[in-house]
Each structure stands twice: as C-alpha cells, then as structure tokens.
C-alpha cells in the first residue's frame, strides 16, 4: 500500500538565460527509493539510480546538472523550457510515486516586473 506523499516546488517561474532547481521530496513512507526519473513532458531528462548514480540524457547534458540531492538543476533556460516536469520515484515495496512541477520561463523584462501566472 502506498502511504507516502510527494512534495514538489510546485509552480515556479524563472528568467530566460537563468537556471532553476527542480526539487521533489518523498515523505511519510519507509519505502526504499531505488531510482528517481526526471522527465520533461514526455522526454527523459535524467535518472538517479541508488546503485549506479546519475545518468543525464545526452540531448540535455549541456544544460542539466544533477542535484542538489535527488533534484535537478536546469541551466541556460529558454522560453521553450516552459512546461511540466515530472519526478518519478521508483520505490520498494510501494511502487512509483509521481510529482509534477510547472515551470514558466519568462523574458527577462517580464520577470523583472514580477509577472505572475495561474496554475498550471
């Protein structure tokens, strides 16, 4: 039975050209985390395996850095990075937990004026 919950950084915004940390945290379970997958929409960004460590997808290796922790750092952001990101925790014996983060990348001038957007 799945008793845990995923907490995420939720809905966030960042400036074009900047960087952002995507963070998920699994709580309220004693299940062992065997692997965390980070996916952008339907593409695999990175994997953190408990035994093998990090693997960054080749198409993202120039702009994605592992960590901090099980999180992921996205660099050199572009407007095309706007969208949803998923952290998928593979655990034993619970199974998989999924968290969703929505990132909006703003033009610098817009971000400076404190633009806000509504969920998603």
């Amino acid at each position: 039975m799945m008793t845990g919950t995923i907490e995420t950084t939720g809905n966030i915004s960042a400036e074009k050209g900047g960087s952002i940390i995507l963070q998920c945290h699994l709580s309220s379970t004693t299940a062992q985390v065997t692997q965390v997958n980070w996916e952008q929409q339907d593409q695999l960004l990175a994997i953190c395996n408990a035994d093998l460590g990090w693997h960054i997808s080749p198409s993202f290796k120039d702009r994605v850095a592992p960590g901090p922790g099980l999180g992921l750092t996205l660099q050199s952001l572009t407007v095309n990075d706007t969208g949803e990101y998923f952290c998928i925790y593979h655990t034993y014996p619970d199974g998989t937990y999924t968290g969703r983060i929505f990132l909006e990348v703003l033009e610098s001038s817009v971000a400076e004026h404190g633009a806000r957007f509504q969920i998603p």
Epitope: Q41, D42, T82, G83, E84, Q118, I119, P120
Partner: nanobody
C-alpha cells in the same frame, strides 16, 4: 487559441464510474493535454496529463483508478474515472498542460456520494 469544453460529469455513488470528455475547437496533436480539478475550498490540482505519443502521467491520488486517453481525430481528451471516492468530488477542467493558462473553461462537476 484552442477552446476547450468539458462534459460528462454528474452524481455517482462511491465505487462508481464516470467518463469525462474534453472537446477542443482545434488540433490537440503535439500538445500536452491535462485534466485538473478543484474541490470546494481547495486549490486547483493536477490530475493527469497525456502527450501525442501516448505517454501518460497521473497524480498519486488517482493512479490505478483513472485513465486518460485522447482521440486526435476527434480533438477530444477523455478521463475514465473508476472506483470513485467522495474525495474525488470537484469541478474537473481540461487544459493545455504545458501552457500558463489564465482562462479556464466552465469545467464539469463530479459529485461522489458515500
């Protein structure tokens, strides 16, 4: 701008099923489409997303009970909801899940009685 109209909600007993539909006025191909819901007095929350290659994602609270699907030819996204619980009671909305959205449709009300 693609207009979205949700339908299929209703009153159902706990353990029952409903199938929600979201009809789009334009193509949904190559767009990530999602279902969201808002219960009374709570914030709107993400439920599920689907992509043009069939890849799907689900919130943990609905995983194993809800199934998202899309018919690109009909420009329609569906949410099959089984084993409904009272806590699933909410207004359900569909949206382009990869786009900041300022205007939501009217949604469709789902009420699950115990």
């Amino acid at each position: 701008e693609v207009q979205l109209v949700e339908s299929g909600g209703g009153l159902v007993q706990a353990g029952g099923s409903l199938r929600l539909s979201c009809a789009a006025s334009g193509s949904i191909f190559n767009i990530g489409m999602g279902w969201f819901r808002q219960a009374p007095g709570k914030e709107r929350e993400w439920v599920s997303s689907i992509y043009s290659n069939g890849h799907t994602y689900y919130a943990d609270s609905v995983k194993g009970r809800f199934t998202i699907s899309a018919d690109n030819a009909k420009n329609t996204v569906y949410l099959q909801m089984n084993s409904l619980k009272p806590e699933d009671t909410a207004v359900y909305y569909c949206a382009n899940s990869n786009k900041p959205k300022f205007d939501w449709g009217q949604g469709t009300q789902v009420t699950v009685s115990s």
